[in-house]
Structures are given as structure tokens and as C-alpha cells.
């Protein structure tokens, strides 16, 4: 004969568990019905009734099988540093991300409670660790013979170009200025001259070498002076 | 459902310590409170201590307050049992069962239980 099929509340065999979507109601001392996500228990088991479930009011959520007497409050709305990653319904909390260019300072249960900006390396400083989801943008001092002249939270430090004759070498913040040494052209008086760098760049991934090219016919000398070498900025 | 897995349990001094660990999977473990049971062979199964849904507030059974210590690691989805000075009479095996939202320890029913760990306090 086939095993009886027992229904909810019924009392479990002594050692044994209930069974999936049932729990063990420790009043009653039977297995109980929980109620399925986007509900609640309006009624808790006894042992000759089973639990009875009613809908989460808006606002409120149950993601679980369950049988909380209330449904839980749906988290505040996102604040104007976040994005709504997932709405409030019935089943789900809302869950509030950090907008780009801001990471999660305080994490909570899903989602971020406090978002902060990526911090931004000055000019003589890159970034040594890109900024995550949950971390800090690293700045870190240019080493000699590299620089960086933004103020950002993804440039690193770039090499200085490679001159055959250097015009105004370069510094931290700066990148080095050449000038050239064959006469291909006549020019007007006091032009500098900026060949093309051995190396090309990238704003954000370490640069690969290219052969020397053709010197250029002009360029131009950065404006003013160069900034203080300060690590970030909260700007 | 979240699935349970218990481990950490031997054979022990008395005097010693223990500590157990309560893995969950299927999933997060935050959402829940969680208990640990022991049961010692030929008795009912008792609830040693809790540890509530937001981690706010913990429970232990007279016979262990003092010398055991609840505690959850909720990135690495785990529940742990630290025991001191342990005595014969903690001889059982210790069980980890859950409650979703579970707001007040004890717990108010019981939802998955792992296959326990036995624990063995003997000279």
C-alpha cells in the first residue's frame, strides 16, 4: 500500500523533519504551511488548523517562504547619489546602487546605505587600485620618469615620451618636452619643436612602445605653472 | 531553501574548547535567525542558543550561558558556536536550524535542519 500522504498541521515522526515549504511550529508542535514570497501569516497553525496567509501591503515584502505575522518594510527610496537597481514589490526590497563615479562607503543587508565619490589623484599622482563597487580609488606619487597632468579617479601615471634632444624635461605633473635637431625646414624664430613620442598613450591602460616617427613642426608649452603635487582631491 | 551543513565537532577534554560552524547555501543566511540544538542521546532536543534575523540580539540556555559564544559571518554565509570550558553533560549532537525573519529568539518554529555534529566531551 502506499505511505499515507499527511496534511498540514499533522505531527512529524519523532527524529524526522517537515517536509519543504512546511516548518515546525513550536506552539503547536506540528507541521505548518509557511506562506509562499509576497505573503505573511495572518493566522498561525494550530493543531486541527493550518496557517493562513494573507498578501504584503504596499510598501512591505516577504522574499522568503515564511511565516512572519508582518511583512517587511520596503527600504526608503534612494537617495540622489544612488540608483534604483530593483524596485519594491510585493516579494523584493528595494535596492539602491551607487551612481558612477561614487562607491558603496556603508553596505547594507542588499545594496548600498551610504555612497561617497571616487576619490581623484591630482596631477603627480595616478591611480594605484581603481575604485570598486565598495572601494576607494588608491592614488599613488608619480614614480621618476612618469607623470600625470589630470586631475581623475582612473588616469595612471604615463611615461614620459622619449626625446632625442630634450627641450624641457619632464617632471611628475608634466610630460617631458623635446626638440629636434635636424634642420628638415626653416622656421620662424624661437619654435620649438615636439617629434612624435616613441610611445603612445592611453588615459587609462599602461601604454605600448611604438618606433620614433618624423619629428612634428610645432607645439605648444603647457600654460602656467605646475600645479602643487598634492595626492586627491575630493572634487 | 536554505540549505545547512554543520561541522566543527570531535571528541574533547573536559575544560576544552570547540568551535562549530554552520554553513548555509541555496541562500543568505542574514535573512534568517538561526539556532543552535542539541541533542544528547535519549533526551529531547534542546535550544542551546539563537541569534536573531538583523544580528541585534542573542539567547543562550542557563546550562551554557557564560561559556558559549553565538555569532554569524554573514559574508562568508556561515553560523558558529564557539564553546568553552566544555563539560560531559554538552555531550550531543549539536544541530543548526533556522527561522526566516526570525525578530525573537527562541525561535518561534523551526525551518531547515542540517545533519548535525556530534560533539564528545570525555577523559
Known amino acids: 500500500l502506499p505511505a499515507q500522504v499527511a496534511f498540514t498541521p499533522y505531527a512529524p515522526e519523532p527524529g524526522s523533519t517537515c517536509r519543504l515549504r512546511e516548518y515546525y511550529d513550536q506552539t503547536a508542535q506540528m507541521c505548518c504551511s509557511k506562506c509562499s514570497p509576497g505573503q505573511h501569516a495572518k493566522v498561525f497553525c494550530t493543531k486541527t488548523s493550518d496557517t493562513v496567509c494573507d498578501s504584503c501591503e504596499d510598501s512591505t515584502y516577504t522574499q522568503l517562504w515564511n511565516w512572519v505575522p508582518e511583512c517587511l518594510s520596503c527600504g526608503s527610496r534612494c537617495s540622489s547619489d544612488q540608483v534604483e537597481t530593483q524596485a519594491c514589490t510585493r516579494e523584493q526590497n528595494r535596492i539602491c546602487t551607487c551612481r558612477p563615479g561614487w562607491y558603496c562607503a556603508l553596505s547594507k543587508q542588499e545594496g548600498c546605505r551610504l555612497c561617497a565619490p571616487l576619490r581623484k589623484c591630482r596631477p603627480g599622482f595616478g591611480v594605484a587600485r581603481p575604485g570598486t563597487e565598495t572601494s576607494d580609488v588608491v592614488c599613488k606619487p608619480c614614480a621618476p620618469g612618469t607623470f600625470s597632468n589630470t586631475t581623475s579617479s582612473t588616469d595612471i601615471c604615463r611615461p614620459h615620451q622619449i626625446c632625442n634632444v630634450v627641450a624641457i624635461p619632464g617632471n611628475a605633473s608634466m610630460d617631458a618636452v623635446c626638440t629636434s635637431t635636424s634642420p628638415t625646414r626653416s622656421m620662424a624664430p624661437g619654435a620649438v619643436h615636439l617629434p612624435q613620442p616613441v610611445s603612445t598613450r592611453s588615459q587609462h591602460t599602461q601604454p605600448t612602445p611604438e618606433p620614433s616617427t618624423a619629428p612634428s613642426t610645432s607645439f605648444l608649452l603647457p600654460m602656467g605653472p605646475s600645479p602643487p603635487a598634492e595626492g586627491s582631491t575630493g572634487d | 531553501e536554505v540549505q545547512l551543513v554543520e561541522s566543527g565537532g570531535g571528541l574533547v577534554q573536559p575544560g576544552g574548547s570547540l568551535r562549530l560552524s554552520c554553513a548555509a547555501s541555496?541562500?543568505?543566511?542574514?535573512?534568517?535567525?538561526v539556532a543552535w540544538f542539541r541533542q544528547a542521546p535519549g533526551k529531547e532536543r534542546e535550544e542551546v542558543s539563537c541569534?536573531?534575523?538583523?544580528?541585534?540580539?542573542?539567547n543562550y540556555a542557563e546550562s551554557v550561558k557564560g561559556r558559549f559564544t553565538i555569532s554569524r559571518d554573514n559574508s562568508k554565509n556561515t553560523l558558529y558556536l564557539q564553546m568553552n570550558s566544555l563539560r560531559a553533560e554538552d555531550t550531543a549532537v549539536y544541530y543548526c536550524?533556522?527561522?526566516?525573519?526570525?525578530?525573537?529568539?527562541?525561535?518561534?518554529?523551526?525551518?531547515?535542519w542540517g545533519q548535525g555534529t556530534l560533539v564528545t566531551v570525555s577523559s
Open positions: 536550524t533556522t527561522e526566516p525573519y526570525g525578530s525573537s529568539c527562541p525561535l518561534s518554529g523551526y525551518d531547515t
Open positions: 541555496g541562500s543568505r543566511l542574514d535573512y534568517y535567525a
Open positions: 541569534i536573531t534575523y538583523s544580528g541585534g540580539s542573542t
